[in-house]
């Protein structure tokens, strides 16, 4: 004989649990139906009557199968420095995200942003790191040898120094290298290629801790067929 299907409410077998989308009501001591997302329990079950569900009212929601007597209130409207990425519906809460140039300083448990803050700016000698701080703010990193940043920005990364046949002024962490104009009388002489390295710098990012000190400039003699090695070290 096929197993009988129990209709809610029903008393569970000793040691067994209620089925999916059911809950055990400790007062009725029965397995009863949960309400679907977008609804809430209007009337709890009894030993003989199942849960009665009702739709969530405007500006309230339930995201999961539930037996709550009241739907949850949607969060307040997004503030002027935020954008609404998910609207409040009967089945989901409103989600607010920070507009460009800001990060979320205080998140709600549902993932919406409660408070946005302006992104920190990295000062000359420091670029924006590829990873973010745990709170979503910009992380600044000192420009690695061979790279520089001459801006105060929340988006600019360290850029490679220009490569000169003849170097006029070496670059450092906060300035680019300056190349000398090529002299035609020197064209037959084996060239010394300059890979400009930053000089020690005391610059530090705005709103950030100071970075490590920089290595001094290095002059590399490469002969007439130079091979350029670019540093991949992090700063």
């Amino acid at each position: 004989l096929p197993a009988q299907v129990a209709f809610t409410p029903y008393a569970p077998e000793p040691g067994s649990t209620c089925r999916l989308r059911e809950y055990y009501d400790q007062t009725a001591q029965m397995c009863c139906s949960k309400c679907s997302p977008g609804q809430h329990a209007k009337v709890f079950c009894t030993k003989t009557s199942d849960t009665v569900c009702d739709s969530c009212e405007d500006s309230t929601y339930t995201q999961l199968w539930n037996w709550v007597p009241e739907c949850l209130s949607c969060g307040s409207r997004c503030s002027s420095d935020q954008v609404e990425t998910q609207a409040c519906t009967r089945e989901q809460n409103r989600i607010c995200a920070c507009e460009a140039g800001r990060y979320c300083a205080l998140k709600t448990h549902s993932g919406s942003c409660r408070q946005c803050m302006r992104l920190s700016k990295c000062g000359p000698g420091f670029g924006v790191a590829s990873s973010r701080a745990p709170n979503g703010n910009v992380l600044c990193k000192a420009c690695a040898p061979g790279t520089f940043s001459d801006t105060t920005s929340s988006t600019d990364v360290c850029r490679p120094h220009r490569i000169c046949s003849i170097l006029a002024i070496p670059g450092n962490a906060s300035t680019d290298a300056v190349c000398a104009p090529e002299s035609p009388t020197l064209s037959a002489i084996p060239r010394t290629l300059y890979v400009s390295q930053p000089e020690p710098t005391r610059s530090q990012p705005l709103d950030q801790e100071p970075g490590p000190s920089q290595t001094p400039s290095i002059l590399t003699s490469l002969g007439s067929t130079p091979i350029i090695e670019q540093s991949t070290k992090g700063g």
Epitope: Q26, T27, A41, K42, V43, F44, T46, T48, P69
Partner: antibody
Framework: QVTLKESGPTLVKPTQTLTLTCTFS??????????VGWIRQPPGKALEWLAH???????YYNPALKSRLTITKDTSKNQVVLTMTNMDPVDTATYYC???????????WGQGTTVTVSS | DIQMTQSPSSLSASVGDRVTITCKAS??????IAWYQQKPGKVPKLLIH???TLQPGVPSRFSGSGSGSDYTLTISSLQPEDVATYYC????????FGGGTKVEIK
């Protein structure tokens, strides 16, 4: 307007059975989610839940008093009756009936009736 | 059975004071708690249900909070008309009242 009113004897003797009636208006016990419960309060003491009956006749009793209590309803008369056997002087109290919502809390109470158990 | 331990059993505070009453359940009651106010010689009146939902007509100085087994009723600014005994009721598993808190004015 929802109202409830308790009625019954003000004095009962020890070992006797107490019968209390709750007559209500403004709602019906044939309406889904409606219920009526009984609560008592000895002089100067806390409230104590006794029993409850739902629109579908499902009944619940305080486990400590279950053997002595019976709750019934007469939907057509808008009445709920509580009987309590083997009364004792410690059962002297004000007895209240109250409406219960579908989500199980008491929202409207009767004025209460004082019952004294004494020989 | 669920026991409800209410504290303090009595308190005396000045008008305008913030008053806090707590109820601790012997197990998780999933926010199914209501608070009642009973003035001397009167019937209990529902103030709050489902932990924090204020009944219509109840002054906003009354608020409720809590989860799991610990719950609180707060009167943000005590008024002379708040002199009463306050009871919690758990309705997560059957029904149990707390022992009551008598609130007086200093």
């Amino acid at each position: 307007q929802v109202t409830l009113k308790e009625s019954g004897p003000t004095l009962v003797k020890p070992t006797q059975t107490l019968t209390l009636t709750c007559t209500f208006s403004g709602f019906s016990l044939s309406t889904l989610g409606m219920g009526v419960g009984w609560i008592r309060q000895p002089p100067g003491k806390a409230l104590e839940w006794l029993a409850h009956i739902w629109w579908d006749a499902d009944k619940y009793y305080n486990p400590a008093l279950k053997s002595r209590l019976t709750i019934t309803k007469d939907t057509s008369k808008n009445q709920v009756v509580l009987t309590m056997t083997n009364m004792d002087p410690v059962d002297t109290a004000t007895y209240y009936c109250a409406r219960m919502t579908g989500t199980r809390y008491f929202d409207v109470w009767g004025q209460g009736t004082t019952v004294t158990v004494s020989s | 059975d669920i026991q409800m331990t209410q504290s303090p059993s009595s308190l005396s505070a000045s008008v305008g004071d913030r008053v806090t009453i707590t109820c601790k359940a012997s197990q998780n009651i999933n926010k199914f708690i209501a608070w009642y106010q009973q003035k001397p010689g009167k019937v209990p009146k529902l103030l709050i249900h489902y932990t924090s939902t204020l009944q219509p007509g109840v002054p906003s100085r009354f608020s409720g909070s809590g989860s799991g087994s610990d719950y609180t009723l707060t009167i943000s600014s005590l008024q002379p008309e708040d002199v009463a005994t306050y009871y919690c009721l758990q309705y997560g598993v059957l029904w149990t009242f707390g022992g009551g808190t008598k609130v007086e004015i200093k």
